[in-house]
């Protein structure tokens, strides 16, 4: 008789990323007997929840159950029923909920309570919903990309998994951009740190890693835009804000109450003689860049070197994977290629921002106008953040790799979070098992 492969013993895990602008559900799978190996867990599904981030449900938490239904039902379909009860479900909320918690602990707790109650109604092994720290978000993003790139593996490979993978075991730094915060995480050359708050020590697969990480709350792309508008409206002579970060001909009315709703704009808050103002785009990259730079306080640094706002940043070291909104924005702008220099990126941004709004709308007819209108700002912000905020240079720009997926799994904190909570990253190098996961009889 023909040799037949025994069915693999497959395990699944679910992580919900409750971000500031939306929630995504990720389903991961791995062969059970290989769960301590590196690189065996991969993403099988991403389900984007329809609607805004959970922090926007503060006054309608009774709708959270319905909000989560479609993606949780999708998970029910994708994961075999026999596996449901042993499939862990984790929900991690990031900066949107951190900001809500700053405003009201009671409201943030209520949202999480209702999320927990909703998720507990499914047949999975629900493990809780919590607001993860910025440090965790940075660290888990770093673990994810290095796990997927095979950097923790002690076996040297004769082949390359992804184009920018080198066979050395030097880890990649992680650059993560969300709507409300941004994280930078990497292993610096110098093992001693001037700022213990930014230092993490890991022992993974028998190797020690001294990692630098920082999360800048309010410096995600959406909150950075609110900050910029709040800063610029202070000096506007009337209720018209001529804004270089929007395309020429673009117009939008903004409520002052919306502008000052977020804790991120508190430092710019003032009594204005109007309740609304109109953004009028003038599309000038250079002026937009200058306006964005004013969000970064670089005049004060109590360390040998800082990023901005007095936050320690050691000298950059090695390659970096830039993911989440870093990737989404640069991918939209067609600027993710390894061959595009920083000078070329700047040139293309200048060209893009100066294009008239009507022309842009025609060229990208399928894109929602709300998102489309903000790419000039977002692209400019990314350049400013990387160059002036984190001190990348024209030379070191080539060490930034804009990454969406690695081996079919999204780059982001969720995989690292699950690997940690399921104890799938051992401190020591596991002994290799004699059998592969497909055994033939």
């Amino acid at each position: 008789t023909q040799n037949k492969a025994l069915p693999e013993n497959i395990k699944y895990g679910i992580v919900l990323d409750a971000g500031s602008s939306h929630t995504s559900l990720y389903i991961y799978k791995w062969p059970a007997e290989k769960e301590n190996d590196t690189g065996v867990v991969h993403q099988v599904e991403e389900c984007r929840v329809k609607g805004p981030g959970i922090s926007k449900y503060v006054q309608k938490v009774n709708e959270i159950g319905i909000y989560l239904t479609d993606c949780m039902e999708r998970a029910r379909e994708v994961i075999p029923r026999s596996q449901h009860q042993e499939t862990p479900v984790y929900l991690g909320a990031t900066a949107g909920m951190r900001l809500l918690r700053m405003e009201s602990e009671e409201l943030a707790d209520r949202v999480l309570d209702v999320v927990e109650r909703s998720l507990s109604n499914y047949p999975f092994d629900f493990q809780g919903a919590r607001i993860i720290t910025g440090q965790e978000e940075g660290a888990y993003g770093w673990i994810t990309i290095n796990y997927l790139l095979g950097k923790f593996s002690q076996k040297t490979r004769w082949f390359s998994i992804v184009p920018y993978e080198t066979n050395n075991q030097e880890t990649f730094g992680a650059l993560d951009l969300g709507g409300a915060s941004t994280q930078i995480t990497f292993v610096p050359q110098n093992q001693t740190t001037e700022s213990p708050d930014n230092a993490l020590q890991f022992r993974l697969y028998g190797k020690d890693y001294n990692v630098y990480t920082h999360s800048f709350l309010c410096y995600g792309k959406d909150q950075a835009l609110w900050q910029k508008l709040a800063k610029d409206i202070q000096v506007a002579s009337n209720e018209i804000l001529r804004d270089p970060c929007f395309h020429p001909g673009y117009k939008k009315v903004v409520n002052v109450s919306d502008l000052y709703k977020t804790p991120c704009t508190k430092r710019f808050e003032m009594t204005l003689p109007f309740q609304q103002f109109e953004i009028q785009g003038i599309g000038n990259y250079q002026q937009c860049h200058q306006s964005v730079l004013e969000l970064f306080n670089t005049s004060y640094c109590p360390y040998s070197q800082c990023a901005f706002n007095g936050i320690f940043l050691p000298p950059l070291q090695g390659d970096f994977g830039a993911f989440s909104a870093f990737y989404f924005v640069m991918n939209f702008l067609n600027l993710t290629s390894e061959k595009v220099s920083q000078e070329k990126v700047t040139e293309m941004m200048k060209k893009f921002c100066s294009q008239p709004w009507e022309e842009i709308k025609t060229s990208y007819a399928g894109v929602k106008e709300k998102y489309l209108s903000e790419y000039c700002f977002s692209g400019t912000y990314i350049l400013s953040l990387l160059l002036q905020g984190y001190h990348f240079t024209a030379d070191s720009w080539e060490h930034i790799h804009f990454i969406g997926k690695i081996q079919g799994s999204d780059a982001g904190w969720t995989l690292g979070y699950m690997l940690n909570l399921t104890n799938m990253i051992p401190a020591e190098q596991p002994l290799s098992t004699p059998l592969s996961h497909s055994t033939y009889v």
Epitope: K56, Q59, N62, S104, L107, S257, K261
Partner: antibody, heavy 121, light 107 residues
Framework: QIQLVQSGPELKKPGETVKISCKAS????????MNWVKQAPGKGLKWMGW????????TYADDFKGRFAFSLETSASTAYLQINNLKNEDTATYFC??????????????WGQGTSVTVSS | DIVMTQSQKFMSTSVGDRVSVTCKAS??????VAWYQQKPGQSPKALIY???YRYSGVPGRFTGSGSGTDFTLTISNVQSEDLAEYFC?????????FGGGTKLEIK
């Protein structure tokens, strides 16, 4: 203590516009939504909809879509109801009522004193 | 829309009596029902939420019961200050709706 104080009575002609205010005090304005309820003379209560004071999102009952507009002035902890192109059938007392979370759902726990609007030519 | 029917427009009672005001929903609304008291020339005052939970400060003589489609507000040991109109209200589905009201008269 928690209070919702509404603006005074209004006498208007058909076709005109009226804007009623509801000033909240004693709690954090943006932590609770605001409902609007109509009570025509000698009639029952009719829910008009609510405004999310945190996001600005508007929810209108079908009968109140079109000429009716809810708005906010967050800095003044005030919600507004504007009725455009007034008709005789808009003659009523309008109440604002706080939307609060009790036992897994939202109720109207505190009410304004009401604003009487009379539409007459 | 869910129709909330308060079949008795008026109810007459005496001080010290026990009276029950009823309300019927056209569809199942679970326990998402509230009761309000409105005195002449005043705004409604919240008495009961979630069908049977009293707001703080509401006297113990007011009790709510029911679930699904049938709900009752009971006032035991009626006082003269209870002279008012009582409205039931469902907040289970949009649009939220109110009953037509029951006026309580004191003999």
């Amino acid at each position: 203590q928690i209070q919702l104080v509404q603006s005074g009575p209004e006498l208007k002609k058909p076709g005109e516009t009226v804007k009623i205010s509801c000033k909240a005090s004693g709690y954090t304005f943006t932590h609770y939504g605001m409902n609007w309820v109509k009570q025509a003379p000698g009639k029952g209560l009719k829910w008009m909809g609510w405004i999310n004071t945190y996001t600005g999102e508007l929810t209108y009952a079908d009968d109140f879509k079109g000429r009716f507009a809810f708005s906010l002035e967050t800095s003044a902890s005030t919600a507004y109801l504007q009725i455009n192109n007034l008709k005789n059938e808009d003659t009523a007392t309008y109440f604002c009522a706080r939307r609060a979370y009790y036992r897994y759902d939202y109720v109207m726990d505190y009410w304004g004193q009401g604003t009487s609007v009379t539409v007459s030519s | 829309d869910i129709v909330m029917t308060q079949s008795q427009k008026f109810m007459s009672t005496s001080v010290g009596d026990r009276v029950s005001v009823t309300c019927k929903a056209s569809h199942n609304v679970g326990t998402n029902v509230a009761w309000y008291q409105q005195k002449p020339g005043q705004s409604p005052k919240a008495l009961i939420y979630s069908a049977s939970y009293r707001y703080s400060g509401v006297p113990g003589r007011f009790t709510g019961s029911g679930s699904g489609t049938d709900f009752t507000l009971t006032i035991s040991n009626v006082q003269s200050e209870d002279l008012a109109e009582y409205f039931c209200h469902q907040y289970n589905n949009y649009p939220y709706t109110f009953g037509g009201g029951t006026k309580l008269e004191i003999k």
